[in-house]
């Protein structure tokens, strides 16, 4: 096709597993937004592959990816963000393997910050309030956060709880007296735009007041 | 500051090769795309060829596909244009070009060498 | 293949007046456009990229507007350093191409 690259050699191109996946970042870096690719197999040799987006773009039809290691990725404004794009693994000019995705389905959120945990003694109670850059966006504003905590002796027993504003009421009764706690959040787009769960939150570690003899509740 | 200084212009005649080069210091070669573009004389720009800032993807115009091969030696902060089976029409003041955008493929040119002229004649 | 064409190719402009150029393109080029100014003997200078934005260090005079096939570079009130060939370039697709040029001289 007129104007368009040479391939390269493919040699045994054809029998490896290309199979990828993507998520964006709106609005990641001010107004760029960012998209992000890898082979879901690990091994796979990318020694010669790219990842090229088409469609739905603004000024220019196609955008090569940029390598950095493993990963392939774009940060730019010029995402349409309606409709879908093609998304391929090429070498030279021959497409490997390509998927039709609409990068409103697959975006993940940054994760929250700021997590933090004040023991109110007259209520009884935990106000866990943690922050998210979302607040301040123009597209991705509408997250369901998921906050899990933990005993911290308790390796696997995560107890969950859903919730769309930033901040949570965690009842003193309904945790261990004397007991180090483990807390953390994540979030998920959820309104409009679909994708996956951000990264956690770094952990927050609080202790609950050991239990008052005389009344029977938590120092 | 970036610098663009393109070398290897001279008279062929037609049938001939030259191989052009492009010598680039002020910036990281390895992350832009890069490109030649002509200018017969009197005459309009003609753009000629585009590799990525891989080095993995070529492009050109139908006038000078298979005639003309463009390469990068980021080692070397050097673009080449090899040019083979000149003709007449290949007369031109040759620019290298860099894109204002780094990585992707945003190919509107920020800075330009200042020329090298091959004369194609007999 | 996307075909450019500039127009007029060339304007005569008293210095202080306003210039207006064209460049219409085959098909919609989505915004991928940009304006370069060339002094003989000189490389081509950019001026204006994604259609309307302005390059770095360009003075306010000049501009960019348009969208789908129809563009357009104003100099709002010309100087004497702004007599020129000024050539639009697309970049939404492969083959780049450029327009003819306009040759904007002083009447």
């Known amino acids: 096709e007129s104007g368009y690259a040479q391939n390269g050699d493919l040699e045994d191109a054809e029998l490896d597993d290309y199979s990828f996946s993507c998520y964006s970042q709106l609005e990641v870096n001010g107004s760029q937004h960012s998209l992000t690719c890898a082979f879901e197999d690990p091994d796979v040799n990318t020694t010669n592959l790219e990842f090229e987006i088409c469609g739905a773009l603004v000024e220019v039809k196609c955008l090569n990816f940029r390598k950095l290691q493993e990963i392939y990725f774009i940060e730019t404004k010029k995402f349409l963000l309606i409709g879908k794009s093609n998304i391929c693994v090429k070498v030279g000019e021959k497409s490997l393997t390509c998927k039709k995705i609409d990068l409103t389905t697959i975006v993940k959120p940054e994760a929250p910050f700021d997590l933090s945990v004040i023991y109110r003694e007259g209520a009884n109670d935990f106000v866990v309030t943690f922050n998210t850059s979302h607040l301040q966006k123009k597209y991705v504003k509408v997250l369901m956060h998921d906050v899990a905590y933990r005993q911290e002796k308790d390796e696997n027993k995560w107890t969950h709880v859903n919730l769309s504003s930033t901040k949570l009421t965690l009842l003193q009764r309904k945790l261990q007296p004397a007991a180090m706690y483990e807390i953390k959040v994540r979030s998920i787009p959820d309104h409009y735009f679909k994708g996956f769960w951000s990264e956690w939150s770094p952990s927050y570690y609080f202790r609950t007041p050991e239990i008052n003899n005389s009344s029977g509740e938590m120092d | 500051q970036v610098q663009l200084v393109e070398s290897g212009g001279g008279l062929v005649k037609p049938g001939g090769s030259l191989r052009l080069s492009c010598a680039v210091s002020?910036?990281?070669?390895?992350?832009?795309?890069m490109a030649w573009v002509r200018q017969a004389p009197g005459k309009g720009l003609e753009w000629v060829a585009t590799i990525s800032a891989s080095g993995l993807r070529t492009y050109y115009p139908d006038s000078v596909k298979g005639r003309f091969t463009i390469s990068r030696d980021d080692a070397k902060n050097s673009l080449y244009l090899q040019m083979n089976s000149l003709r007449a029409e290949d007369t031109a003041v040759y620019y290298c070009?860099?894109?204002?955008?780094?990585?992707?493929?945003?190919?509107?040119?920020?800075?330009w060498g200042q020329g090298t002229l091959v004369t194609v004649s007999s | 293949e996307i075909v450019m064409t500039q127009s007029p190719a060339t304007l005569s402009v008293s210095p202080g007046e306003r210039a207006t150029l064209s460049c219409r393109t085959s098909e919609d080029i989505y915004n991928g456009l940009a304006w370069y100014q060339q002094k003989p003997g000189q490389a081509p200078r950019l001026l204006v990229y994604s259609a309307n934005s302005l390059h770095i260090g360009i003075p306010a005079r000049f501009s960019g507007s348009g969208s789908g096939t129809e563009y357009t570079l104003t100099i709002s009130s010309l100087q004497s350093e702004d007599f020129a060939v000024y050539f639009c370039q697309q970049y939404y697709d492969y083959p780049l191409a450029f327009g003819g040029g306009t040759k904007v001289e002083i009447k």
């Open positions: 002020g910036f990281t070669l390895s992350d832009y795309y």
């Open positions: 070009a860099r894109p204002m955008s780094a990585h992707y493929g945003f190919n509107y040119f920020d800075y």
